[in-house]
Structures are given as structure tokens and as C-alpha cells.
Interface confidence: low
């Protein structure tokens, strides 16, 4: 449905508040270093222009595409060249190349200061003084640090952020009310950002077909009573939504996501019995709720898969006539029967099935050739099952912190070239799989664990892509989206790695460690552990444990000392010497 003015169309569909918020998110995700005030000014100019187009769709420039309008606006920023360097070259290009150029310059790890949370009273005063600016600042700060954050979902986070301040700033104990809510929003926000980053990587690096396959599997698990045609329609619409958001088309994305939620709720009888509560909520909550809805119950008496996909004489005929549709049906049928499998496992099975048909449908006796295809699935299913069992046992034995440390050592030995902050961040997140998933019964463990690990390993992949240092990481990240985790699991110690020179400065600590939160102190210790492994990759678990225990005791002792700084200086030298001796450095 063509509109004379795309900007007027979206302004009317979304309303002024959402329009302004989404344009701010879009601009902050593109120009991540620009000051808040500059972005607000640009957003206000775009909004005023949009209003003129709403009044008269034939007005000058109202017929231009959103990319043209937004790109032209971004290219008016005076300091573009000095702040962003070669990104300024994007402005010499025409659409659609200009937008593609901006997208390529999005930075997953921008050089921005850590967000420090002010005192509760300071935040409440700021909230009361100017609520609108306070909430815009939240959108801006999150968007620039997470340039692929799912924009309509960020509106939902902002709504919850506002609700937290509205409630808690008038509570008797503001801090007790507000801080847990902010912690929860922060943790959920990081998880949401990472999940969306995987969707965008899937689309951008592996293509629409890869994303659609993921969506077929996930939606079939979630809506096992829905017909294949219904799931296909949802997959097509969902793919459009995420393609738009990952491509920076945030207004279209938010609009289409709202349409999809509306469709799902109007057709919930043919989709899922679990949607009723979600569909009673307001728009932002509704969309979020649908995205997180639990799996519906599987229909009773589903027939065996073998009949249609192995025993039928028409397998090759059906495959040849419409390959992706036939494979989609296979994936749908398998996934709806297996909510206990991870999506990536289901995709591996579908890939194995596809490869088998490619080979067998060209053979002299196709049926004979593919008759045992389901037997090939057994080792693929058992591998993640065994891995999860072993790691959950290790997690239960060690607890989260020490489990993270075990993973830190494991991954540093696999890919020691990767930067220490990245290894610490990724291994800490890998370690969280224990508390997140090991508590679940067997039937829920694999989808929880392996699909979560896919999200975390994608963080490693996107951070590594920015500054590639390891061929092994590149290989695991680029060869196959669904085999990333097995690829990393299969990596052994990198025998080609030349140990890092010993640098005492790396292991010098000061009294400031004593005032850090428990989490930040853990990160300091884990950073030291990674550096130790980089110096001595052949160190045994026992050696590393002894050094880390000594280190923990050293920190505890010096933090209790009267003259902390002197203690850290003197005892630190002794610790370094003892560690060198223990590790044979």
C-alpha cells in the first residue's frame, strides 16, 4: 500500500511519542559518539518536518524515503569527520548504499564510559525536574551502547523504567524500592540486546533463509497446534520485522511488529491456547508477552515422522518440487514434537536431512539410500545432551564463580589470542548458563542451555569480528551458524600459541580493589586468571587453583590491613614471586 509520504504514514501510525523515541534510538544507534543534546535537536527537526507532511503529504521533500530523510539529517552533523573518521565517507554515497555504509560502521564495543548510577535522590530529582528529558536520556544511553537493540522492545524497557521511578521516588525507602528494579532492567536489557544481536547476525551474515529456518523451529515449538501454513505466515512476518530493525528501519519495524501482535491476537484460536493473557495487555506489553510466551501443549497422537519423510515413495518428488517448503515442513513437524530440543539442534537435524536428500535423490535407489537417515540423528542429539549433563554436574559441584573460572581457563587455552576483557566477559556469561538452566528438569535443559550459549558465543563472534586475532574464532564463527557451539566445544588447547611475556604490572593490585562491589572484584580476579593462563597455557588446574587461592587470600588480608596500600605493594611483590615459582615462569 503506497503512501504519498512515508514519514507522514509512520508518524500517524505510531503517534508522536513513539515516533520521536524511535527516531532518537535510530540516530543514537548510528552516531554512537554524538552528544545527547545534538541528537535531541536532530530528532526535534525531523519531528517538526514530519508534522508538516502530516498536514500536507504533497509538501516539499515529504515524498522522500525515510533513509533519505534520516541520512540527510545525520550528514548535517558538523563534527562527523573528526568524530567518526571514515564513516563520514558514507555521506558521499547515495541511498541505499549510504544506509548500508552507516550500518557497517555500527560498533558493538563503542569506546564509551561505563554508565555509573548516580545516588537515588539525584536520580529522583532529575526524574521529577524533567521527566521527558530523563527518559530520552535513558533511550539514548542504551541505544548508543547497544546499536542493535530491538527498538520496539526498548520502548517497553523505557516504559518500565518510567514506572519504576514513578513508583519508587515517592516510596518511604526509595533505594530499597528502586535499586532492585533497576538491576533487573539492566540484566534483562543486556540479555535482550544479546538475543537481538544474534538475530541480526543471523540475517546479516547467514541470510534470510537461515533466520527463517530458526523462526520455523522456534515458532513450531511454541505453537505446536498451529498449522504449517499459519507458522509459515508468522515466520514471513517476523522475518520482515527483524530484517527492518536490523537494517535500521525502526519506524517500519515497530509498526509491523504492532501489526503482527494484532494478527496473532485476532487469530489466537488457530495459533496457541497460551496467548489469552498476553492479548489483554496494552501494545508494548502485549508484544513482549507474545515474544516470551510459554510453549503450548503438543497435540495428542501426532503420527510418526517417518511416514512422510522416510517411508513415503514421494520424498524425492516432494523435495524436488519445492525444496525449502519441504524442508520447512520437516523442520515444523520435528520441532513441534520436540520442545525438549534446542533450536540449533533441530536445525542441525534439518541440515543433515537436507544433505542426505541432496545425495540420495541423485542415487540409483533413493529410498534405499535415505532409509536410515533418522539413525544419523542419534549422535547429533546425544552430543549436546552429554555436554549439558557434564557441565551441569560441574556447575553444581563448583558454584557459579568457580564454574566461570573453569570456563575462563578452558576458553583462554582454546583461543588465547582473544583480548582479556572479551574472554572475561564471554566466559562469565557462558558460566551463567549454570544458574540459568541447570535448575530446569531434563526436558527444558537443552533448549535453555544450548540456545543461550548460541547467544553468548555470538557476542564473542561480533566482538572478534571488529578486531580479528584468531583464525580459530573466525572459522567457528563463520562456517556454520548452527555449529558454532560444537565448533568451539571441539577446540583443543592452541598448541601454536606463543606464551605472553611476563609483566609484573599486570599482577599489581592496589587498595582500590577493596572498595569494589563483589562482582567487580570477581572480574579483577578473573582478569588476572586469564592473564596467568596466557603466560602459562600449560599450567595445570591444580597450579592455577593454588595461585588463585593465594591471590584471594592476599586481597582479603590487605583489605583488612591498616595501611592497605603498603600491604598491596609489599605482599603483592611476594605473591608475584611465589606465583612465578609455582608456575615455573
Amino acid at each position: 500500500d503506497a503512501h504519498k509520504s512515508e514519514v507522514a504514514h509512520r508518524f500517524k501510525d505510531l503517534g508522536e511519542e513513539n515516533f520521536k523515541a524511535l527516531v532518537l534510538i535510530a540516530f543514537a544507534q548510528y552516531l554512537q559518539q554524538c552528544p545527547f543534546e545534538d541528537h535531541v535537536k536532530l530528532v526535534n527537526e525531523v519531528t517538526e518536518f514530519a508534522k508538516t507532511c502530516v498536514a500536507d503529504e504533497s509538501a516539499e521533500n515529504c515524498d522522500k524515503s525515510l533513509h533519505t530523510l534520516f541520512g540527510d539529517k545525520l550528514c548535517t552533523v558538523a563534527t562527523l569527520r573528526e568524530t567518526y573518521g571514515e564513516m563520514a565517507d558514507c555521506c558521499a554515497k547515495q541511498e541505499p548504499e549510504r544506509n548500508e555504509c552507516f550500518l557497517q560502521h555500527k560498533d558493538d564495543n563503542p569506546n564509551l564510559p561505563r554508565l555509573v548510577r548516580p545516588e537515588v535522590d539525584v536520580m529522583c530529582t532529575a526524574f521529577h525536574d524533567n521527566e521527558e528529558t530523563f527518559l530520552k536520556k535513558y533511550l539514548y544511553e542504551i541505544a548508543r551502547r547497544h546499536p542493535y537493540f530491538y527498538a520496539p522492545e526498548l520502548l517497553f524497557f523505557a516504559k518500565r523504567y518510567k514506572a519504576a521511578f514513578t513508583e519508587c521516588c515517592q516510596a518511604a525507602d526509595k533505594a530499597a524500592c528502586l535499586l532492585p528494579k533497576l538491576d533487573e532492567l539492566r540484566d534483562e536489557g543486556k540479555a535482550s540486546s544479546a538475543k537481538q544481536r544474534l538475530k541480526c547476525a543471523s540475517l546479516q551474515k547467514f541470510g534470510e533463509r537461515a533466520f527463517k529456518a530458526w523462526a520455523v523451529a522456534r515458532l513450531s515449538q511454541r505453537f505446536p497446534k498451529a498449522e504449517f501454513a499459519e507458522v509459515s505466515k508468522l515466520v514471513t512476518d517476523l522475518t520482515k520485522v527483524h530484517t527492518e530493525c536490523c537494517h535500521g528501519d525502526l519506524l517500519e519495524c515497530a509498526d509491523d511488529r504492532a501489526d503482527l501482535a494484532k494478527y496473532i491476537c485476532e487469530n489466537q484460536d488457530s495459533i496457541s491456547s497460551k496467548l489469552k493473557e498476553c492479548c489483554e495487555k496494552p501494545l508494548l506489553e502485549k508484544s513482549h508477552c507474545i515474544a516470551e510466551v510459554e510453549n503450548d501443549e503438543m497435540p495428542a497422537d501426532l503420527p510418526s515422522l517417518a511416514a512422510d519423510f522416510v517411508e513415503s515413495k514421494d520424498v524425492c518428488k516432494n523435495y524436488a518440487e519445492a525444496k525449502d517448503v519441504f524442508l520447512g515442513m520437516f523442520l515444523y513437524e520435528y520441532a513441534r514434537r520436540h520442545p525438549d530440543y534446542s533450536v540449533v539442534l533441530l536445525l542441525r537435524l534439518a541440515k543433515t536431512y537436507e544433505t542426505t536428500l541432496e545425495k540420495c535423490c541423485a542415487a540409483a535407489d533413493p529410498h534405499e539410500c535415505y532409509a536410515k537417515v533418522f539413525d544419523e540423528f542419534k549422535p547429533l542429539v546425544e552430543e549436546p545432551q552429554n555436554l549439558i549433563k557434564q557441565n551441569c554436574e560441574l556447575f553444581e559441584q563448583l558454584g557459579e564463580y568457580k564454574f566461570q573460572n573453569a570456563l575462563l581457563v578452558r576458553y583462554t587455552k582454546k583461543v588465547p589470542q582473544v583480548s582479556t576483557p572479551t574472554l572475561v566477559e564471554v566466559s562469565r556469561n557462558l558460566g551463567k548458563v549454570g544458574s540459568k538452566c541447570c535448575k530446569h528438569p531434563e526436558a527444558k535443559r537443552m533448549p535453555c542451555a544450548e540456545d543461550y550459549l548460541s547467544v553468548v558465543l555470538n557476542q564473542l563472534c561480533v566482538l572478534h569480528e571488529k578486531t580479528p586475532v584468531s583464525d580459530r574464532v573466525t572459522k567457528c564463527c563463520t562456517e556454520s551458524l548452527v555449529n558454532r557451539r560444537p565448533c568451539f566445544s571441539a577446540l583443543e588447547v592452541d598448541e601454536t600459541y606463543v606464551p605472553k611475556e611476563f609483566n609484573a604490572e599486570t599482577f599489581t593490585f592496589h587498595a582500590d580493589i577493596c572498595t569494589l562491589s563483589e562482582k567487580e572484584r570477581q572480574i579483577k580476579k578473573q582478569t588476572a586468571l586469564v592473564e596467568l593462563v596466557k603466560h602459562k597455557p600449560k599450567a595445570t588446574k591444580e597450579q592455577l587453583k593454588a595461585v588463585m587461592d593465594d591471590f584471594a587470600a592476599f586481597v582479603e588480608k590487605c583489605c583488612k590491613a591498616d595501611d592497605k596500600e603498603t600491604c598491596f605493594a609489599e605482599e603483592g611483590k611476594k605473591l608475584v614471586a611465589a606465583s612465578q615459582a609455582a608456575l615455573g615462569l
Epitope: 547467514f206 541470510g207 541432496e358
Partner: nanobody, 123 residues
Framework: QVQLQESGGGLVQPGGSLRLSCAAS????????IAWFRQAPGKDLEEVSC????????NYADSVKGRFTISRDNAKNTVYLQMNSLKPEETAVYYC????????????????WGQGTQVTVSS
């Protein structure tokens, strides 16, 4: 309509080199594995080389290993086949073909084809 367009063919002496290009119009090659096939007069279609959509996987026919190199430049929406030490028996029409994401086992699995470019190796 999606189109692939080969270029870079021509007449070359034995032992010489050519670089073939396969460019796409109306769609982005980012999501497609691209293969090069060749067909000599009176012979069957033969797969020469293929590169996956990410560029992470490449394969070559045994007869061209070490002499031919396939590469891609997604920014230019183009895939290249660098052919060195060409032999007279490699005279053929060279075609590029596209399939979603990954290289396929046989020619009928490729969704889009170019018109072909003639390569003649002769002194």
C-alpha cells in the same frame, strides 16, 4: 528478475591467466553461495569451484586446485574466479550460479544462473 552476469572471458595463451567476475543485479549476493561451472563443446557441465555466502568455505575441482582461486567482495556484490596456468582443454563457456547460503552437491540445486562467458585457451 534476478540476474547474474559473468564477465572477464576471452582468448588467452596456454599458461596465461584470466579473472572472471560474476556480478548480481536486483539482489544482494551476501546471502548466496556462488559456484562456477564450465561446459566444453560436446561435454557435460562441470563444477569448477564454489564459495559459501560467508566466504568461510571454498571448494575446487581436483583438476584446478592450486591454479584457480575463488573469492568474493560483498561490498561490490561480485564473486571472482582467478584462473592461472590455463590449459587448452579448459576452453569452455564458464557460468556462475547461486544457491542460498551453502555450496550444493549438484548443478540442479542452484537457483540462479548467468548467461556464461567464453574462455578460449589457444596459441
Amino acid at each position: 528478475q534476478v540476474q547474474l552476469q559473468e564477465s572477464g572471458g576471452g582468448l588467452v595463451q596456454p599458461g596465461g591467466s584470466l579473472r572472471l567476475s560474476c556480478a548480481a543485479s536486483r539482489f544482494t549476493l551476501d546471502y548466496y553461495a556462488i559456484a562456477w561451472f564450465r561446459q566444453a563443446p560436446g561435454k557435460d557441465l562441470e563444477e569448477v569451484s564454489c564459495i559459501s555466502s560467508s566466504g568461510g568455505a571454498t571448494n575446487y575441482a581436483d583438476s584446478v586446485k592450486g591454479r584457480f582461486t575463488i573469492s568474493r567482495d560483498n561490498a561490490k556484490n561480485t564473486v571472482y574466479l582467478q584462473m592461472n596456468s590455463l590449459k587448452p582443454e579448459e576452453t569452455a563457456v564458464y557460468y556462475c550460479a547461486a544457491a542460498t547460503l551453502e555450496c550444493r552437491g549438484r548443478s540442479s540445486s542452484y537457483d540462479y544462473w548467468g548467461q556464461g562467458t567464453q574462455v578460449t585457451v589457444s596459441s
